[in-house]
């Protein structure tokens, strides 16, 4: 079953390569277990950036080596992606799945265009 997912159209990463955005889903029921996946689309290729499954009311737990962190509040997920460089500029799509209890619902956002600008190197000082 389809579910609406909203996310910002554009986000500019910080000079330290950190980008944050909110992914909000219109839950048709009271899910207890939710999975959030961030997908990156660039040059018609879609790759999974990170994913987390969480129990409602608990923190999102990404893998230890994940570049993502996040928190949840109601039907909102606050996602932060770290370690971004200019080459990582692209469309980041939020996919939300309500896993349990049934029925299974899937929602895919339109994507957030994240722009990353590598910082200029500091000039050498004598």
């Amino acid at each position: 079953k389809a579910m609406h997912v909203a996310q910002p159209a554009v986000v500019l990463a910080s000079s330290r390569g950190i980008a944050s955005f909110v992914c909000e889903y219109a839950s048709p029921g009271k899910a207890t277990e939710v999975r959030v996946t961030v997908l990156r689309q660039a040059d018609s290729q879609v790759t999974e950036v990170c994913a987390a499954t969480y129990m409602m009311g608990n923190e999102l737990t990404f893998l230890d080596d994940s570049i993502c962190t996040g928190t949840s509040s109601g039907n909102q997920v606050n996602l932060t992606i770290q370690g971004l460089r200019a080459m990582d500029t692209g469309l980041y799509i939020c996919k939300v799945e309500l896993m349990y209890p049934p029925p299974y619902y899937l929602g895919i956002g339109n994507g957030t265009q994240i722009y990353v600008i590598d910082p200029e190197p500091c000039p050498d000082s004598d």
């Epitope: 277990e33 209890p101 029925p103």
Partner: antibody, heavy 119, light 111 residues
């Protein structure tokens, strides 16, 4: 008609891996709400849910087997796969694939694949 | 994990008998008016067959002598008039919470 056809019986050594296939016909693995689940049954025992793959491509596993199992699907051939690694004798079982509804009940089953793990 | 306990583990009955199998869950499997509890029949050497889903809905093609009832933690599968082809093992299954779990089975044998 709607059916799932599984690959043939396998005999494996402890520590090795096995990959079982399940070809769907009469329905699409891309249909909304559809998932393919894998369930096993040891000789003379009950049923154990292994995990499932959703039409979205997401997978979900039983924590008791998560570290050793990988479920994949090739939508172009309507085939789902279940790979189990680091096999041990207690993995000897009939492995079934089944179509899962959005409510996670299993309304169509494959014929089963016997996997025997023996040295 | 949600544990499902079936009783009895086995029973002997005759053709025409009314048979009742119970399934008790370790916690409620109800959500928004639906009980996520299903029943399957399995014959030796064959895959399980779905009989009842969502506690009381009869799967298409399943004879009306099979019925399911219950909510919360206590569920029942009833065969109103046992037929020769009904001798098999019956399993309940919950899908309310991961991992999906099954009862240990109830074997219905000929008396």
């Amino acid at each position: 008609q709607v059916q799932l056809v599984q690959s043939g019986a396998e005999v494996k050594k402890p520590g090795s891996s096995v990959k079982v296939s399940c070809k769907a016909s009469g329905f699409s693995l891309s249909t909304g709400g559809v998932a393919v689940a894998w369930i096993r049954q040891a000789p003379g025992q009950g049923l154990e849910w292994i995990g499932q793959i959703y039409y979205s491509g997401s997978t979900y596993y039983n924590p008791s087997l998560k570290s050793r199992v990988t479920i994949t699907a090739d939508k172009s051939t309507s085939t789902a796969y279940m790979e189990l690694s680091s096999l041990r004798s207690e993995d000897t079982a009939v492995y079934y694939c089944a179509r899962s509804s959005a409510h996670y009940y299993f309304d169509v089953w494959g014929q089963g694949t016997l996997v025997t793990v023996s040295s | 994990d949600i544990q499902l306990t079936q009783s009895p583990s086995s029973l002997s009955a005759s053709v025409g008998d009314r048979v009742t199998i119970t399934c008790r869950a370790s916690e409620s499997v109800d959500f928004q008016g639906i009980s996520f509890l299903d029943w399957y029949q399995q014959k030796p050497g064959k895959a399980p067959k779905l009989l009842i889903y969502d506690a009381s809905s009869l799967e298409s093609g399943v004879p009306s002598r099979f019925s399911g009832s219950g909510s919360g933690t206590d569920f029942t599968l009833t065969i109103s008039s046992l037929q020769p082809e009904d001798f098999a093992t019956y399993y309940c299954q919950q899908s309310y919470r991961s991992p999906i779990t099954f009862g240990q089975g109830t074997k219905v044998e000929i008396k």
